[in-house]
């Protein structure tokens, strides 16, 4: 497993750093699990030709992962703070069933799983102590990804890599569209 | 490999648009963590970054000439465009795009074009 | 806006030497940082990525290292190929760079 934040190789170069600001912890966090997620897609390349598919291709399933749009106030043209902020915890949230059925898909990145599904908590309650308005986010409900979870693990083979693929793949891109904005914060 | 290149016009009259299209080759800007960016150099001055477009189509501008900059994307042509308003004789440089590519968004540009030179 | 500041703006130095270029930001960039070497006519190249990492190519007497605000390039004996201008550039809120170290 990658070291966890706060233990890398860069802070052993500077031991006279500053305590870690918020805004620092929150960015180290997203690229600590951003290290997890590459991690995790080299033992999904390496076991299937999912990789080499074409984004169209892969378009056409019927998972519905939390992607940044401009009307989440994450983008340049119409950027709000507080909108960007609550979409990127609901995104969150929501990733956190799709990143609990990873957790049964990998054998020698078991331990990364885990890893990358503990920081994203660790990160989202980073994210709510910055948030101001914590009643706007909506959490999913428990029922509804139960039923998720007994889906997406009844598919075959075939899915399930497609399905590993994909969570991956747009994990990693929400986080590198929250990363972009919350240095605008 | 990557390759990048600019084109447009070398001379450009006072109060003139500028159109610059930056052709490239060797990866696709649908890539998450994938941005180009477009940069000047005034004869013998520094750099100056002028605006990026990133893989989800956002953008982002210099603030103090964001008024006279637009950059958009043709993914299926593999192409970036700038056009740079209300052209002014300070406005001559060495103009570059360059690509940026990691996890991190680090903006390390990491290949770039020869430049053409606008006066 | 981040505004870069580098030191020296020239610099005077002989083969062999060791040189040391500082880069300053005008507020925390963590270590969103990265160094260029320019020649005359061409485009510039990347050195070094992420305030320490050296970017592929790029020859091991290069070396960078800083956090926060403050960045140094080192290179830590002077070839007749380094004669160039040298700047940084921050990458944690979009990109500035700073106004260019020349070596001569």
């Known amino acids: 497993a990658p070291v966890p934040p706060g233990e890398d190789s860069k802070d052993v170069a500077a031991p006279h750093r500053q305590p870690l600001t918020s805004s620092e912890r929150i960015d180290k966090q997203i690229r600590y699990i951003l290290d997890g997620i590459s991690a995790l897609r080299k033992e999904t390349c390496n076991k299937s030709n999912m990789c080499e598919s074409s984004k169209e291709a892969l378009a056409e399933n019927n998972l519905n992962l939390p992607k940044m749009a401009e009307k989440d106030g994450c983008f340049q043209s119409g950027f709000n703070e507080e909108t960007c902020l609550v979409k990127i915890i609901t995104g969150l949230l929501e990733f956190e069933v799709y990143l609990e059925y990873l957790q049964n898909r990998f054998e020698s990145s078991e331990e990364q799983a885990r890893a990358v599904q503990m920081s994203t908590k660790v990160l989202i309650q980073f994210l709510q102590k910055k948030a101001k308005n914590l009643d706007a986010i909506t959490t999913p409900d428990p029922t509804t990804n139960a039923s998720l979870l007994t889906k997406l693990q009844a598919q075959n083979q075939w899915l399930q890599d497609m399905t590993t693929h994909l969570i991956l793949r747009s994990f990693k891109e929400f986080l590198q569209s929250s990363l972009r904005a919350l240095r605008q914060m | 490999q990557v390759t990048l290149k600019e084109s447009g016009p070398a001379l450009v009259k006072p109060t003139q648009t500028l159109t610059l299209t930056c052709t490239f080759s060797g990866f696709s800007l649908t890539t998450s963590g994938m941005c180009v960016s477009w940069i000047r150099q005034p004869p013998g001055k520094a750099l100056e970054w002028l605006a990026l477009i990133y893989w989800d189509d956002d953008k982002r501008y210099n603030p103090s000439l964001r008024s006279r900059l637009t950059i958009t994307k043709d993914t299926s042509k593999n192409q970036v465009v700038l056009t740079m308003t209300n052209m002014d004789p300070v406005d001559t440089a060495t103009y570059y795009c360059?690509?940026?590519?990691?996890?991190?968004?680090?903006?390390?540009?990491?290949?770039w074009g020869q430049g053409t030179l606008v006066t | 806006d981040i505004v870069m500041t580098q030191s020296p703006s020239s610099l005077s130095a002989s083969v062999g030497d060791r040189v040391t270029i500082t880069c300053r930001a005008s507020r925390n960039i963590n270590t969103y940082l990265n160094w260029y070497q320019q020649k005359p006519g061409k485009a510039p190249k990347l050195l070094v990525h992420?305030?320490?990492t050296l970017q592929s190519g790029a020859p091991s007497r290069f070396s960078g290292s800083g956090y926060g605000t403050e960045f140094t390039l080192i290179i830590s004996s002077l070839q007749p190929d380094d004669f160039a201008t040298y700047y940084c550039q921050q990458g944690y809120n979009t990109l500035t760079f700073g106004p260019g170290t020349k070596l001569e």
């Open positions: 992420s305030a320490s």
């Open positions: 360059a690509r940026s590519y990691d996890d991190y968004l680090y903006y390390a540009l990491d290949y």
